[in-house]
């Protein structure tokens, strides 16, 4: 039982670290293997993860690793029964892959203007929470040249867009991820999409 | 306006159980963690526990962490603080309190006063 | 856990003068990624519920008067009130939130 791609972490910096890993052959992960992970801090507890299969010989782990602080580093071994099969530390703050955003929505807004709106998925007690920015992807659902990338990176997770730069009677769906730059985090999951009818009307139309 | 009102309260012998409440309004309920802290009487403030309401996620104070058990009914908007084997020395107001849009305890109840005595 | 100590403990002010109230840390509460400090300072007046002064070490709440200010980093962090007025009367907290939350013992503030 060999291990061909090392585990490769994230933490959501809440709740929740993830590792995943391939071995170099089918393997039933939740049977074979077990994922042990140690706050390297004097006294605490030693904890297991089973894996469960992502492909045939893909194996993912989620650990519950919550009030991540900076200077938190885990010791993780992964074991096949009594054989020790790799061993390496984790350091949530180095490795954040933030919660996706939530409940992306789009209302219409004064002076033909649609407003997008979405939740910040940390509470205001998280460290991340006041550190995150977006990308929002809007594109046209029947044409797919016809796309835009707005980059958010003031506090509010709002986006206002003028219709006027949409297609009139086209229906556009958007979705929206994010990031931590301090944190150098990797992106999010994109969000769900939320779609919509464009029924701008050029002015000079009326 | 946020609003968070507790209630619960009594005198209650050394051994015994209670159940405090607080209702939240003025604010979608999932929104925010939400959490108790506790005064003795003329003594200061201590943090006990709090809840996720969204995902019922819970962590605590471990001084508290075997006799008191935090929870919420999302329906209803309420937290509960459920403290069992109760010692004179839990006598002291029970707050909840929650983060505003920005860092900190921005919101609290008025507090409910629970007394252990024999 | 994270020690909070606060000194003094009563403070005795007439009004008009500065008072300063000081708050460490038995660790660091900065975070070097955000460059922020997870304090936070409260004041309590008599039979009431504590209340938000300043976050983030140096941040005053919205309504607070600017005679109020934060500063300090790491672990040494302190309160100022530039012209105490009798309505200053209270006790001071200083509190942590950069891992779980802890309170410093209060500070008791007397307008003389």
């Known amino acids: 039982v060999k291990v061909l791609h090392e585990p490769s972490c994230f933490s959501d910096y809440i709740s929740t670290s993830v590792c995943q890993w391939k071995m170099d052959h089918p393997t039933n992960c939740s049977a074979e293997l077990r994922l042990s992970y140690q706050l390297d801090f004097m006294g605490s507890e030693n904890h297991t993860c089973v894996p469960e299969n992502r492909e045939d010989s893909v194996c993912v782990c989620s650990m519950p690793i919550d009030d991540a602080v900076e200077a938190d580093v885990y010791q993780l071994d992964l074991w096949a029964g009594q054989q020790l099969l790799w061993s390496g530390s984790f350091q949530p703050s180095k490795h954040v892959k933030p919660r996706t955003p939530g409940n992306l929505t789009v209302y219409p807004n004064i002076s033909h203007t649609w407003l997008l709106m979405w939740t910040n998925p940390y509470p205001t007690e998280n460290h991340l929470h006041s550190e995150l920015t977006y990308m929002v992807n809007v594109s046209n659902d029947n044409d797919p040249e016809d796309f835009k990338v707005y980059n958010v990176t003031y506090m509010g997770p709002t986006l206002r867009l003028a219709a006027s730069t949409l297609k009139s009677g086209a229906s556009y769906s958007a979705r929206v991820r994010a990031w931590a730059q301090t944190y150098n985090s990797t992106w999010s999951d994109w969000s769900p999409s939320t779609t919509w009818l464009n029924y701008y009307e050029p002015w000079e139309q009326h | 306006e946020v609003q968070l009102v507790e209630s619960g309260g009594d005198l209650v012998k050394p051994g015994g159980s209670l159940r405090l409440s607080c209702v939240a309004s003025g604010y979608t309920f999932t929104n925010y963690w939400i959490h108790w802290v506790r005064q003795a009487p003329g003594k200061g403030l201590q943090w006990v526990a709090r809840?996720?309401?969204?995902?019922?996620?819970?962590k605590y104070n471990e001084k508290f962490k075997s006799r008191f058990t935090i929870s919420r009914d999302n329906a209803k908007n309420t937290l509960y603080l459920q403290m069992n084997s109760l010692r004179a020395e839990d006598t002291a107001v029970y707050y909840c309190?929650?983060?505003?849009?920005?860092?900190?305890?921005?919101?609290w109840g008025q507090g409910t006063l629970v007394t252990v005595s024999s | 856990d994270i020690v909070m100590t606060q000194t003094p403990l009563s403070l005795s002010v007439s009004p008009g003068e500065p008072a300063s109230i000081s708050c460490k840390s038995s660790?660091?509460?900065?975070?070097?990624?955000?460059?922020?400090?997870?304090l936070a300072w409260f004041r309590q007046k008599p039979g009431q519920s504590p209340q938000r002064l300043i976050y983030w070490a140096s941040t005053r709440e919205s309504g607070v008067p600017d005679r109020f200010s934060g500063s300090g980093s790491g672990t040494d962090f302190t309160l100022r009130i530039s012209r105490v007025e009798a309505d200053d009367a209270g006790v001071y907290y200083c509190?942590?939130?950069?891992?779980?939350?802890?309170f410093g013992q209060g500070t008791k503030v007397e307008i003389k």
């Open positions: 509190k942590q939130s950069y891992n779980l939350y802890t």
């Open positions: 660790q660091s509460l900065l975070n070097s990624r955000t460059r922020k400090n997870y």
């Open positions: 809840i996720d309401p969204n995902s019922g996620g819970t």
């Open positions: 309190t929650r983060f505003g849009s920005t860092y900190g305890f921005a919101y």
